[in-house]
């Protein structure tokens, strides 16, 4: 079995693919349409489903990364050597069980996702067989940000990254040698996975984000598009 550095056995199905093994286009999942008994998703349920969709996409990308290079087995020292300023949850952000603060946490989640966007752009030319997944992760993250911004009351507290700074960071990352680019890819995916999991844990504490609809396919991940907003 393939096993990545985080210890996850990736022998499970990538649920965001339909039966023909292509990414499900927005709003075109026949299985979704043919379920009139299902309640329409609340905004919180859509956010939950969107995050799980992205996490499944990250799993696919990590699988390719780990099969292609030895980065997933790299020592902790090598991981510690990176100087990437990747967003990370901390106690002060109010997203953990202790000291939970809905407003502070939501601001952190949105700010963090906005900061990740430049790194997701960097990933776009880093995959061969999973090019579609990389694009889907990037696009569905943009939609997730829009969903969350609709939920946030305190939009003024959200700082948007400077485009010029992002452009120079992207240039700098793309100019690295092959080994550093592989390491950067691995670290971005690992950190983004952790950030999304932390976000999902927090969002499931927030009010109406309690249950997900019964789904005969289990956790079938459907890409949510801007038309659904």
């Amino acid at each position: 079995d393939y096993k990545d550095h985080d210890g996850d056995y990736k022998d499970h199905d990538i649920d965001y693919k339909d039966d023909d093994d292509k990414l499900v286009p927005p709003g075109e999942d026949s299985k979704d349409v043919a379920a009139p008994h299902r309640q329409p998703l609340t905004s919180s349920e859509r956010i939950d489903k969107q995050i799980r969709y992205i996490l499944d996409g990250i799993s696919a990308l990590r699988k390719e990364t780990c099969n292609k290079s030895n980065m997933c087995e790299s020592s902790k020292e090598a991981l510690a050597e990176n100087n990437l300023n990747l967003p990370k949850m901390a106690e002060k952000d109010g997203c953990f069980q202790s000291g939970f603060n809905e407003e502070t946490c939501l601001v952190k989640i949105i700010t963090g996702l906005l900061e990740f966007e430049v790194y997701l752009e960097y990933l776009q030319n880093r995959f061969e067989s999973s090019e579609e997944q990389a694009r889907a992760v990037q696009m569905s993250t943009k939609v997730l940000i829009q969903f969350l911004q609709k939920k946030a009351k305190n939009l003024d507290a959200i700082t948007t990254p400077d485009p010029t700074t992002n452009a120079s960071l992207l240039t700098k990352l793309q100019a690295q040698n092959q080994w550093l680019q592989d390491m950067t890819t691995h670290l971005i995916l690992r950190s983004f996975k952790e950030f999304l999991q932390s976000s999902l844990r927090a969002l499931r504490q927030m009010g109406d984000l309690i249950s997900v609809p019964v789904d005969s396919r289990g956790s079938e991940q459907k890409l949510i598009s801007e038309e659904d907003l």
Partner: antibody, heavy 119, light 110 residues
Framework: QSVEESGGRLVTPGTPLTLTCTVS????????MSWVRQAPGKGLEWIGY??????TWYANWAKGRFTISKTSSTTVDLKMTSLTTEDTATYFC???????????????WGPGTLVTVSS | NIVMTQTPSPVSGAVGGTVTINCQAS??????LSWYQQKPGQPPRLLIY???TLTSGVSSRFKGSGAGTQFTLTISGVECADAATYYC????????????FGGGTKVVVV
Amino acid sequence: QSVEESGGRLVTPGTPLTLTCTVSGIDLSSYDMSWVRQAPGKGLEWIGYIYTDSSTWYANWAKGRFTISKTSSTTVDLKMTSLTTEDTATYFCAKGSTDYAFDTRLDLWGPGTLVTVSS
Amino acid sequence: NIVMTQTPSPVSGAVGGTVTINCQASQSISNELSWYQQKPGQPPRLLIYRASTLTSGVSSRFKGSGAGTQFTLTISGVECADAATYYCQQGYNSNDVDNVFGGGTKVVVV
């Protein structure tokens, strides 16, 4: 890869106790860990998780009395206070792998350490 | 507060037969459910995760199904070695929860 608990012993009610989970072949910065206990002849009872983001999540009944912490790159501690006879159980430490948020599948368990609380 | 309820317990099955164990969540947990097997004096062993994905090295005689609130573990071609207690574990939410595990179902092989 292996997981092993230690520190279990006979204590009197009210005595604090710290259990240690020592891992081998596992980088704790990359894995979620959990503590679970089992009273004699009873079912599994979840105590809490410590995730890779360093956040800790506890069962309602464990909040305030139990504390999970990573104490080194190979050890995770469970600190217990105000112990009562109801806390008599085998305490398990388990390594997790998480796909989404809380869905930590516990894929590697230690043999357990017995804590007996008696006067 | 998500509560996991397992039925029946105990359940008996004949060698070569089929045993079905049910696990019900008090609210929808999507497919975020794992199944464990525990034999006396041993720690639990992960059998199935994400409701239906078999863990590496586990016999295909074990099958998990379900989504939402209703889940089932089916053991086909029951063997003596399957005598154990089986637990389901929800992974949808761990905030305001007393226990992520179900109460357990003891399987007796006759």
